[in-house]
Structures are given as structure tokens and as C-alpha cells.
């Protein structure tokens, strides 16, 4: 009796759905009453299928209403774990364990990314020095570097701070500030670059002609 897992690594985006598979041998018609399926994530019970039905009693609260084992797939010898609205905390090693006469188990890793897609920006100016302060902020995971460039694609050094957002999701809140002498219509780019994946997202900032909100004089560097 051998389980096969078509993939042992799934990489998905935060907020999306994931379908992880463990296939087991079925001859003729599946006897659901003889089948036991456990899906576990470390010390958390995700799915328990025993005596022909899912037992929700052991299911860890973090998976409540989000983890499913489609029965139609079971009948085909496919123990599919569907997780909807994937959270960062869902990342980790899952174990599918199947007993159907014989038994076997497979370990599957789930990685969760949250791209820094939605980049908020702000431009302000210090009238005393005519220095502009450019700010880019975004949430994502894992950590990103912020690279500032001008219209000539030259790198500029900004000041980046990373904090863990206070949302339940524990996304990283990355803010970067560039202080620069600039004139109207100058173009700058901030790029959120995730080192490990190489993925990046860029926002364009254009110095406006109109006066921008002034910076307070007592700001600290």
C-alpha cells in the first residue's frame, strides 16, 4: 500500500486557495467505512475522515470552515486537502496519513507568499530646504528590500523600516523614505524586491508642480 503525492511542495499566495493531493490505491469500489484519512499540520488536526465521514471535533480552530476533504475525490482514490483563504500561518509541513487495509503517509510542504503589490506613496516637501521626502509603504511576506531609482535608473539610498503589522495576519509592513532635492516632474521609482523569490513590484512617484504638504520643521532624522 503506497500513497503518492504528485507534489511535495506547494507555493501559494496569501488569500488564495490551495489544493494538496495524496493519492492511494483503490480497486473497484471504495469502501468508505474502511478508510481513514488524517491530514495534520504539526500539532494541529486539519482533517480527520473516519467511519465514512469527516470528524470535525478534532479540527483545529484555525482551519474551521476553511479546510475540506472532497468526498467525490476520495472515491477516486484521491485524498485532497482544500484550504481556502490561505493565511501566512498555514505555511508549514503537512502530513497526509491514509489507512485502507494497508497504510502509508506523505509529508507535503506549503509555503505562503504575500506580494507587495499595493504600494502606497506620499510626497512632501520641506519649504526651508526645498528637499522632498518620498515615501513608499506596502504590506507583504516574506521581507522585502526597497530600492529607489531615478529616471536615469541610478540607485539612490533611502531609509527603510520594517515592522510587523498589527493585523491578525502578521504581514510585514515595509516603509521606505527617500529624501532628495528634486524639481517638478522629476520621476522616481520605489521597488519592493523580495530577495529569495526575486519577485518585485514597483511604484512611480512624480514630483508635482503644485505645492505639496509641507514637512514639520521639528522632524528627526
Amino acid at each position: 500500500f503506497t500513497i503518492t503525492a504528485p507534489k511535495d511542495l506547494y507555493v501559494v499566495e496569501y488569500g488564495s486557495n490551495v489544493t494538496m493531493e495524496c493519492r492511494f490505491p483503490v480497486e473497484q469500489k471504495l469502501d468508505l467505512l474502511a478508510l481513514v484519512v488524517y491530514w495534520e499540520k504539526e500539532d494541529k488536526e486539519v482533517i480527520q475522515f473516519v467511519e465514512g465521514e469527516e470528524d470535525l471535533k478534532p479540527q483545529h480552530s484555525s482551519f474551521r470552515g476553511r479546510a475540506f476533504l472532497p468526498k467525490d475525490q476520495l472515491l477516486k482514490g484521491n485524498a485532497v486537502l482544500q484550504i481556502t483563504d490561505v493565511k501566512l500561518q498555514d505555511a508549514g509541513v503537512y502530513c497526509c496519513m491514509i489507512s485502507y487495509g494497508g497504510a502509508d503517509y506523505k509529508r507535503i510542504t506549503l509555503k505562503v507568499n504575500a506580494p507587495y503589490r499595493k504600494i502606497n506613496q506620499r510626497i512632501s516637501m520641506d519649504p526651508a530646504t526645498s528637499e522632498h521626502e518620498l515615501m513608499c509603504q506596502a504590506e507583504g511576506y516574506p521581507e522585502a528590500e526597497v530600492i529607489w531609482t531615478n529616471s536615469d535608473h541610478q540607485s539612490l539610498s533611502g531609509e527603510t523600516t520594517v515592522t510587523t503589522s498589527q493585523t491578525e495576519e502578521k504581514l510585514l509592513n515595509v516603509t521606505s523614505v527617500l529624501r532628495v532635492n528634486a524639481t517638478a516632474n522629476d520621476v522616481f521609482h520605489c521597488t519592493f524586491w523580495r530577495v529569495h523569490s526575486g519577485e518585485n513590484h514597483t511604484a512611480e512617484l512624480i514630483i508635482p508642480e503644485l505645492p505639496v504638504p509641507r514637512l514639520p520643521h521639528n522632524r528627526t532624522h
Partner: antibody, heavy 118, light 109 residues
Framework: EVQLVESGGGLVQPGGSLRLSCAAS?????????WGWIRQAPGKGLEWIGI????????NYAQKFQGRVTISRDNSKNTLYLQLNSLRAEDTAVYYC??????????WGQGTLVTVSS | DIQLTQSPSSLSASVGDRVTITCRAS??????LNWYQQKPGKAPKLLIY???SLQSGVPSRFSGSGSGTDFTLTISSLQPEDFATYYC???????????FGQGTKVEIK
């Protein structure tokens, strides 16, 4: 090759505590597998105490030991720990740490003997 | 709680003999059952996992079978290095626990 080395055994007074260490090499304790403690009293069988999981550090303990056992780890030292309190003579045993796969334990340390006696 | 009872508790056999050890569960269980070998003064060694799968590096003379309440470990042709104590162990997902049988000692006749 995974290697586990237990230490910290010896003579302990009844009512006292023990803290055993298990140094792992050849595999990171924060990756993938769970890690367990099992004991064996002299001339007796194997008895599962508890396990700790890699990333979140969650634990499960055998009902018998609930309330007086703590399993912890230090990822930077790649070391597991077993703390057992309120010791009595029947806690005299060889204590093993082991790596857990899906259903059982595939790598074991050599064990460390704890004797509870006054 | 599920109890595992091994039989016999001990047995005497000769090199070349076929040896069968039984592990009986107090109620029907999934086949998440393992077998270990332990030699005096040594740590246990995993032989069979999930009732019938041979652990990597274990000689093919060891095999496991069974389901429900009755599981067996068979040594097809006993070798001198096989004289040891054998334990069955069951895994339960919820509440999470690992239960061992009391052991079967295989001695030289």
C-alpha cells in the same frame, strides 16, 4: 546521518526535578520532523512521554505525564530538552530522545539513565 | 484508551526458523502501526512502519502485515543478530498519542 545524544541523567532525589538535553546533529530540529521523548524503566517496555513540533514549537504529552512534564527546544543550539518534575522512584528509567516521522520514531539517541532515589 | 497486547511475551527459536509475533489492539485501529527491534543496552530501531512498509536499510527477511485488531511481524529466517526484543507501536492522531506494546523477547533455543 542524523545523530542524537542525550545528557543530564544521573541520581535525583525523590520530589526533585530532572532536565535532560538532546543534542541533534545532521539535521535541523526546526525542519520538518517532530521530536519525542520515550523512556524505559529497567527490565520494562517503552513508554512515550511527549513530542515537540518543528516550526511552531507546539507540544503533545502522554496523559500520564500531563502537568509535570515540559518539552522545549533551542533551535540555535539544535537541542531538545525534557523537564520532569515531582520525581518518584518509578520515574527511574533510561530516557531516549527520538526523531518522529509520520507515524513513529526513525532515529533514536543512545539514552541517558535517570535514577530516582534518596 | 487503546491497549496493544503482544504475544507471545517471549519465545525461543533457532537460527533459520520462521518467527511470527502478534500485536493485538483492544479495538479496531487504522494500520498506523510500527515495529521496533531493541537489543540489550541499545536504543530501539524502527523496522516496519504503517503495518507493512519496510524501513530503509532493514533486511527483507522482516515483514509486517495485518489490519483492524491483529497485526503481525514475521522474520522469515531468523539470523543470529535477530535475537532481541520486539515492540509494536500505534499512532493515534487525536488525541495525539503513541502507544507501545509490552514487547516480545526472542531468545536462542
Amino acid at each position: 546521518e542524523v545523530q542524537l545524544v542525550e545528557s543530564g541523567g544521573g541520581l535525583v532525589q525523590p520530589g526533585g526535578s530532572l532536565r535532560l538535553s538532546c543534542a541533534a546533529s545532521g539535521y535541523s530540529i526546526s525542519s520538518g520532523y517532530y521530536w519525542g521523548w520515550i523512556r524505559q524503566a529497567p527490565g520494562k517496555g517503552l513508554e512515550w512521554i511527549g513530542i515537540i513540533y518543528p516550526s511552531g514549537g507546539g507540544t503533545n504529552y502522554a496523559q500520564k505525564f500531563q502537568g509535570r512534564v515540559t518539552i522545549s527546544r533551542d533551535n540555535s543550539k539544535n537541542t531538545l530538552y525534557l523537564q520532569l518534575n515531582s520525581l518518584r522512584a518509578e520515574d527511574t528509567a533510561v530516557y531516549y530522545c527520538a526523531r518522529g516521522g509520520g507515524l513513529g520514531f526513525d532515529y533514536w539517541g543512545q539514552g541517558t539513565l535517570v535514577t530516582v532515589s534518596s | 484508551d487503546i491497549q496493544l497486547t503482544q504475544s507471545p511475551s517471549s519465545l525461543s527459536a533457532s537460527v533459520g526458523d520462521r518467527v511470527t509475533i502478534t500485536c493485538r489492539a483492544s479495538q479496531s485501529i487504522p494500520s498506523f502501526l510500527n515495529w521496533y527491534q531493541q537489543k540489550p543496552g541499545k536504543a530501539p530501531k524502527l523496522l516496519i512502519y504503517a503495518a507493512s512498509s519496510l524501513q530503509s536499510g532493514v533486511p527483507s527477511r522482516f515483514s509486517g502485515s495485518g489490519s483492524g485488531t491483529d497485526f503481525t511481524l514475521t522474520i522469515s529466517s531468523l539470523q543470529p543478530e535477530d535475537f532481541a526484543t520486539y515492540y509494536c507501536q500505534h499512532y493515534i492522531s487525536w488525541p495525539r498519542q503513541f502507544t507501545f506494546g509490552q514487547g516480545t523477547k526472542v531468545e536462542i533455543k
